[in-house]
Amino acid sequence: MNGRVDYLVTEEEINLTRGPSGLGFNIVGGTDQQYVSNDSGIYVSRIKENGAAALDGRLQEGDKILSVNGQDLKNLLHQDAVDLFRNAGYAVSLRVQHRLQVQNGPIGHRGEGDPSG
């Protein structure tokens, strides 16, 4: 029998400075593109090598982005969320939710689409 998988959820404010090639990450999610069941939130799906986010080091694949420059990302269409990031300016403040897996017992399998990464 597999051990129970629990999650530790933490929030963090991450301030990024837009680099020459931008912020350096990809997102999934939105009201028209639910990546996680029953959750239309915006999640980080890729951190680009040597991009601003990667060099900062705090944003991780699987993180949920709650707000950009204080603007809530709830109930946004996917492309509207993309556009919000693209128009966010040079200094970008992200409120993010990290969901860390805490393993109790045997190691389980974390599948694609699981927001923990």
Partner: nanobody
Framework: QVQLVESGGGSVQAGGSLRLSCTAS????????MAWFRQAPGKEREFVAA??????YYADSVTGRFTISRDNAKNTVYLQMNSLKPEDTAVYYC?????????????????????WGQGTQVTVS
């Protein structure tokens, strides 16, 4: 890890048509940005077409002749190639990345994509 498998390549005479398919693993295919690139012998890999959540993109050399589309229920992206020319002869590669970049999207940049297929040969005589 995403696996990509291309099919549909072959030999055709100039003016003919082919439809390439690329099937991807993974249950969140609808979130993938997908692209086709090609590489002719002795030449660099060249962007052909891409399809993201926001729409389709094409290289100038194929605009009006090639059409990229996707069927999310089948985890498959297609490249319909019409009015083929000898210069379209190449190995055609499917590429994918999960999600949409929050930066300016340059579909022709191979670094935008994390996953690549093995390629399928297209020969136009």
């Amino acid at each position: 890890q995403v696996q990509l498998v291309e099919s549909g390549g072959g030999s055709v005479q100039a003016g003919g048509s082919l439809r390439l398919s690329c099937t991807a693993s993974g249950r969140t295919f609808s979130t993938y940005t997908m692209a086709w690139f090609r590489q002719a012998p002795g030449k660099e890999r060249e962007f052909v077409a891409a399809i993201s959540w926001s729409g389709a993109y094409y290289a100038d050399s194929v605009t009006g002749r090639f059409t990229i589309s996707r069927d999310n229920a089948k985890n498959t992206v297609y490249l319909q190639m019409n009015s083929l020319k000898p210069e379209d002869t190449a190995v055609y590669y499917c590429a994918a990345v999960i999600g949409s970049t929050v930066d300016s999207y340059w579909p022709g940049d191979p670094l935008e994509y994390d996953y690549w297929g093995q390629g399928t040969q297209v020969t136009v005589s």
